[in-house]
Interface confidence: medium
């Protein structure tokens, strides 16, 4: 019962759901399910039967390995997939794959919330805007990463002449993609170009 594999893939890609071990020899039947009650395909030692489902036409079963190929996965395909095998001995076994489909992150837009010249220092507040996604943020000043504690959607920092950077980059990433947005300043403390 303890077979649970997590997979994260990018939307639009083709995915292979398979198990890391060999299938039981000469099994009698193999079924792939989507969530609990949606049969995708069933193989019963003679032929594969594909069920009416949202996967019809974009899945293929390899009875040899038990692998299920799904083309052009979308976020709606997020779920736990279950492969159930009936062995010749009568025992049954199952494997579960929790599939997470993520969209590639969009290119972020950097908004200058505040930029203020303060006695040779530059107070800077930048926000990195992308439409409602759960992502990680990394800020760079002239390609050098800012400390970890400053890594969220807003960068707020006071720059002194000795650590003044010209360009600021926000990198947004999820587990399948990453994109950058950059703004550059003209010394001492004005927006140059985006």
């Amino acid at each position: 019962q303890g077979h649970l594999v997590h997979m994260t893939v990018v939307s639009g890609s083709n995915v292979t759901l398979n198990i890391s071990e060999s299938l039981p020899e000469n099994y009698k039947q193999l079924t792939w399910f989507y969530t609990f009650d949606q049969k995708i395909v069933e193989w019963d030692s003679r032929k594969s039967k594909y069920f009416e489902s949202k996967f019809k036409g974009r899945v293929r079963l390899d009875p040899q390995s038990g692998a299920l190929y799904i083309s052009k996965v979308q976020k709606e395909d997020n779920s736990t997939y279950i492969m159930r095998v009936l062995k010749k001995t009568g025992n049954e076994q199952e494997w579960k794959i929790k599939l997470q489909v993520l969209d590639p992150v969009p290119k972020p837009v950097i908004k200058i919330e505040k930029i203020e010249d303060m006695d040779d220092n530059c107070y800077l507040k930048l926000s990195c805007v992308i439409p409602g996604e759960s992502v990680n943020y990394t800020w760079y000043g002239d390609k050098r990463p800012f400390p970890k504690e400053l890594q969220n959607s807003v960068l707020e920092t006071t720059l002194m002449p000795h650590n003044y950077s010209r360009c600021y980059t926000c990198q947004v990433s999820n587990s399948v993609s990453s994109k950058n947005g950059t703004v550059c300043l003209s010394p001492p403390c004005t927006l140059a170009r985006s």
Epitope: Q1, K28, F36, S79, R84, N91, E92
Partner: antibody
Framework: QVQLVQSGAEVKKPGASVKVSCKAS????????IHWVRQAPGQGLEWMGI????????RYAQKFQGRISMTWDTSTSTVFMELSSLKSEDTAVYYC??????????WGRGTPVTVSS | DIQMTQSPSSVSASVGDRVTITCRAS??????LAWYQQKPGKAPNLLIF???SLQSGVPSRFSGSGSGTDFTLTISSLQPEDFGTYYC?????????FGQGTKVEIN
């Protein structure tokens, strides 16, 4: 040894709700399924629904759709089944069962629920 | 939904008798069938899964057979402790459905 421990007997008035708990002792629910099955006095077994605490998926029998809810607290390995708008026909023993997706190899002792005005 | 029909609804037999209970599914369920025994006031207990596989700890006098739509539970030599109600259940798909039960009484 793994056990499913259920909450105690309940007496409810028609229209009320009941919430029955099922705690796994000697085991956590991660990667397992819990089903709820009920049995009215002198009657057979009736499947109500299933929950997978690992990913939040639930399925309910059509008959109970709209008045049943299965939730869980993974930190205490407890699953809850709440049935609302109770009627006298809901008088039954409610069992949690499962740990196997395809059949029920482990059962709680059952929680008697009486619905009476 | 898949309908499960059990017969007989009750059977009375003597110790040592061979007892057979049948279960019919309204559609092909391959070998996806389980059998349970329930004693009064107790939760059901799994006897057989995948139509013919004996659950560990269950005496070998219990056996299951069948596939497709017709299934059988056999108690080869009835013992006094085998009284109770026996249920079949299809495990092919949701919703899970049970037969109406067969009550086994000892003469």
């Amino acid at each position: 040894q793994v056990q499913l421990v259920q909450s105690g007997a309940e007496v409810k008035k028609p229209g009320a709700s009941v919430k029955v708990s099922c705690k796994a002792s000697g085991h956590t629910f991660t990667n397992y399924y819990i089903h709820w099955v009920r049995q009215a006095p002198g009657q057979g077994l009736e499947w109500m629904g299933i929950t997978n605490p690992n990913d939040g998926n639930t399925r309910y029998a059509q008959k109970f759709q709209g008045r049943i809810s299965m939730t869980w607290d993974t930190s205490t390995s407890t699953v809850f089944m709440e049935l609302s708008s109770l009627k006298s026909e809901d008088t039954a023993v409610y069992y949690c069962a499962g740990l196997r997706y395809w059949f029920f190899d482990l059962w709680g002792r059952g929680t008697p629920v009486t619905v009476s005005s | 939904d898949i309908q499960m029909t059990q017969s007989p609804s009750s059977v009375s037999a003597s110790v040592g008798d061979r007892v057979t209970i049948t279960c019919r599914a309204s559609q092909d369920i391959s070998s996806w069938l389980a059998w349970y025994q329930q004693k009064p006031g107790k939760a059901p207990n799994l006897l057989i899964f995948a139509a013919s596989s004996l659950q560990s700890g269950v005496p070998s006098r219990f056996s299951g057979s069948g596939s497709g739509t017709d299934f059988t539970l056999t108690i080869s030599s009835l013992q006094p402790e085998d009284f109770g109600t026996y249920y079949c259940q299809q495990t092919d798909n949701f919703p899970r459905t049970f037969g109406q039960g067969t009550k086994v009484e000892i003469n």
